[in-house]
């Protein structure tokens, strides 16, 4: 079986302030088992935007029903975008581990730019 790929089909997305931004991500396989997370930025200082497994992310909704059997679409929508949300967002697959899940593969990233709200 082919190794899982993390697909972020847009290199960049531009959204007006106050609107919602949809960031698309899909996996090509259900294996390995483990959650996905969305981060803004890369490296040690990256910011967690969404964790499929746990946490409260009031501005983030998933585009498809993540609990649905065989779901491979992990796209998210972030509401009420502000200039502070600009940056590169990464969809990251983790492999289930004990005691902690282990990062398995990251998407290439989608750069979110924020336009001024139309007057």
């Amino acid at each position: 079986e082919d190794e899982l790929q993390v697909i972020q089909p847009e290199k960049s997305v531009s959204v007006a302030a106050g609107e919602s931004a949809t960031l698309r991500c899909a996996m090509t396989s259900l294996i390995p088992v483990g959650p996905i997370m969305w981060f803004r930025g890369a490296g040690a200082g990256r910011e967690l935007i969404y964790n499929q497994k746990e946490g409260h992310f009031p501005r983030v909704t998933t585009v498809s029903e993540l609990t649905k059997r065989n779901n491979l679409d992990f796209s998210i929508s972030i509401s009420n975008i502000t200039p502070a949300d600009a940056g590169t967002y990464y969809c990251v697959k983790f492999r289930k581990g004990s005691p902690d899940d282990v990062e398995f593969k990251s998407g290439a990233g989608t750069e979110l730019s924020v336009r001024a709200k139309p007057s």
Partner: antibody, heavy 121, light 113 residues
Framework: QVQLVQSGAEVKKPGSSVKVSCKAS????????ISWVRQAPGQGLEWMGG????????NYAQKFQGRVTITADESTSTAYMELSSLRSEDTAVYYC??????????????WGRGTLVTVSS | DIVMTQSPDSLAVSLGERATINCKSS????????????LAWYQQKPGQPPKLLIY???TRESGVPDRFSGSGSGTDFTLTISSLQAEDVAVYYC?????????FGGGTKVEIK
């Protein structure tokens, strides 16, 4: 080794439609986008539109919007391009081409051999 | 849409000599997030589909001979064939992939002098 295998040449009347297929032989569509690029006789390359089968969504060049429909069947690893309201200027070789979204380089790394569509009354 | 302009339209070069093709984009094809230029070069021989030679402006596709090289950044790019071989006779196209729709240059026909 993956190949993109296209359907055979077509001769069509003006005003009719044509549907061309592109099958990924020896592989799947899972981490790819499939685009359609046409080349009129002696001319350059023109992108018509593309689809990401894993998402099922297509996007089209403005020039072809409303006249072209691109679809994909993941179960058979086949993409389709249908062009309607054909006119003589649509006579061209139509290529399907693959972008490997997993690699993030976004260029067309694999091409079908092309399907010649001739529009003539 | 980003307009890609190639020059010259055609080029005749002696066997073993250098061939240089230029490509200019109407906007930068540099993607700031990864500092890559989303510019590719293709070779098309008569009756065949295009073949990817170079991507990210200067990265050779697997199996492409090292006499082919790409350079440039931003809006100005060059494809160089360091020592032209008979099998290099073809039309060469540049293409940007930084934004939709992907757009191609008009092509440069390379012939033997």
């Amino acid at each position: 080794q993956v190949q993109l295998v296209q359907s055979g040449a077509e001769v069509k009347k003006p005003g009719s439609s044509v549907k061309v297929s592109c099958k990924a032989s020896g592989g799947t569509f899972s981490s790819y986008a499939i685009s359609w690029v046409r080349q009129a006789p002696g001319q350059g390359l023109e992108w018509m539109g593309g689809i990401i089968p894993i998402f099922g969504t297509a996007n089209y060049a403005q020039k072809f919007q409303g006249r072209v429909t691109i679809t994909a069947d993941e179960s058979t690893s086949t993409a389709y391009m249908e062009l309607s309201s054909l006119r003589s200027e649509d006579t061209a070789v139509y290529y399907c081409a693959r972008q490997d979204l997993g690699s993030s380089h976004w260029h067309f790394d694999l091409w079908g051999r092309g399907t010649l569509v001739t529009v003539s009354s | 849409d980003i307009v890609m302009t190639q020059s010259p339209d055609s080029l005749a070069v002696s066997l073993g000599e250098r061939a240089t093709i230029n490509c200019k984009s109407s906007q930068s094809v540099l993607f700031s997030s990864n500092n890559k230029n989303y510019l590719a070069w293709y070779q098309q021989k008569p009756g065949q589909p295009p073949k990817l030679l170079i991507y990210w402006a200067s990265t050779r596709e697997s199996g492409v001979p090292d006499r082919f090289s790409g350079s440039g950044s931003g809006t100005d790019f060059t494809l160089t064939i360091s020592s032209l071989q008979a099998e290099d006779v073809a039309v060469y196209y540049c293409q940007q992939a930084v934004s939709d729709p992907p757009t191609f240059g008009g092509g440069t026909k390379v012939e033997i002098k």
